[in-house]
């Protein structure tokens, strides 16, 4: 089939990185700069993606593959192939329509992206709070009070914080 096809269509012989140039008797011409063809037999080359503005070039376009973008410092990629750049926030914050806002009490975010998530409820697993949560860190759950039979463990439950859930300043 390939042999028959190539006899009928000279363009099928053009490899990736070239295009079948109708202006030059259908010979295979290299893709111009800023364009590429990832498969053979193409009659045109595709225009390369340009990483502009908040995007920056992570990988230059080659004759056979498109450019790849990432985001400038202070932003991170969202979507397939980094189709969008979203502003970073600090740990302990989340991005809202009004900008970066601190996590509400009882929630945390340990990354520069994403939303604030509720602290783990230790009691649901029958455990106690070993280390209190902060805006930046989840609580650390310890053994359940029942596990702390006299002499069985040297772990001392933490003194309650002045503001529940937050470490003492």
């Amino acid at each position: 089939f390939e042999r028959t096809r190539s006899l009928q269509d000279p363009c099928s012989n053009c490899p990736a990185g070239t295009f079948c140039d109708n202006n030059r008797n259908q010979i295979c011409s290299p893709c111009p700069p800023n364009s590429f063809s990832s498969a053979g037999g193409q009659r045109t080359c595709d225009i390369c993606r340009q990483c502009k503005g908040v995007f920056r070039t992570r990988k230059e376009c080659s004759s056979t593959s498109n450019a790849e973008c990432d985001c400038t410092p202070g932003f991170h990629c969202l979507g397939a192939g980094c189709s969008m750049c979203e502003q970073d926030c600090k740990q302990g914050q989340e991005l809202t329509k009004k900008g970066c806002k601190d996590c509400c009490f009882g929630t945390f975010n340990d990354q520069k992206r994403g939303i604030c998530r509720p602290w783990t409820n230790c009691s649901l697993d029958g455990k106690s709070v070993l280390v209190n949560g902060t805006k930046e860190r989840d609580v650390v759950c310890g053994p359940s009070p029942a596990d702390l039979s006299p002499g069985a463990s040297s772990v001392t439950p933490p003194a309650p914080a002045r503001e529940p859930g937050h470490s003492p300043q």
């Epitope: 990185g17 111009p32 700069p33 800023n34 070039t57 990988k59 230059e60 080659s62 056979t64």
Partner: antibody, heavy 117, light 107 residues
């Protein structure tokens, strides 16, 4: 930080060949075109060619086809340019530079080639 | 092949003056032109990409304009450190090429 470290000055005889190197660091070597540029004393910049290290794809200006051969070693993140059948007019500073389509953002320090009998 | 012609070959200016460099392409190249500065005994450095896009770390007094065949690099207020050679490069078609350069000198 991105750096392109070029090999040291070369003094060679006419008719000989020489291989210049350009060692890249501070970025993913396979992700950007490497250009090679010639500059004779007191003259302008002359484009020789370019290589895409990921797949070895090369482009040359007509004048340097047969004179220059561009290669890239991914394992050492080094680009090479071999110049053959050297003559006095090949005496020049040769630069490698990273990036092509959006301009060359980073340049090596240049290698001085002197061809003399 | 696309030929790039830079003019004039030499520009003489006084500090604080506004100066413009011309780069003309032998056929239309869209905005695929980049500008470089090369000081004496130094490697070139990229000033402007795609005719008018600024480069991080380059002083704001450098700007570029143009599309098609005529392009201009402008220095808004020349400083002594700007004394150098200036080159344009096209990356619209193979083989890419540099212009012949313009030397900027102080009066």
């Amino acid at each position: 930080q991105v750096q392109l470290q070029q090999s040291g000055a070369e003094l060679t005889r006419p008719g000989a060949s020489v291989k210049l190197s350009c060692k890249a660091s501070g970025y993913t070597f396979t992700n950007y075109w490497i250009q090679w540029i010639k500059q004779r004393p007191g003259q302008g910049l002359e484009w020789i060619g370019t290589i895409y290290p990921e797949n070895g794809d090369t482009r040359y200006t007509q004048k340097f086809k047969g004179k220059a051969t561009l290669t890239a070693d991914k394992s050492s993140s080094t680009a090479y340019m071999q110049l053959s059948s050297l003559a006095s007019e090949d005496s020049a500073v040769y630069y490698c530079a990273r990036g092509l389509l959006e301009g060359a953002h980073y340049w090596g320090q240049g290698t001085t080639l002197t061809v003399s009998s | 092949d696309i030929l790039l012609t830079q003019s004039p070959a030499i520009l003489s200016v006084s500090p604080g003056e506004r100066v413009s460099f011309s780069c003309r392409a032998s056929q239309s190249i869209g905005a695929s032109i980049h500008w470089y500065q090369q000081r004496t005994n130094g490697s070139p450095r990229l000033l402007i990409k795609f005719s008018s896009e600024s480069i991080s770390g380059i002083p704001s007094r450098f700007s570029g304009s143009g599309s098609g065949t005529d392009f201009t690099l402008t220095i808004n207020s020349v400083e002594s450190e700007d004394i150098a050679d200036y080159y344009c490069q096209q990356t619209n078609s193979w083989p890419t090429a540099f212009g012949g350069g313009t030397k900027l000198e102080m009066k």
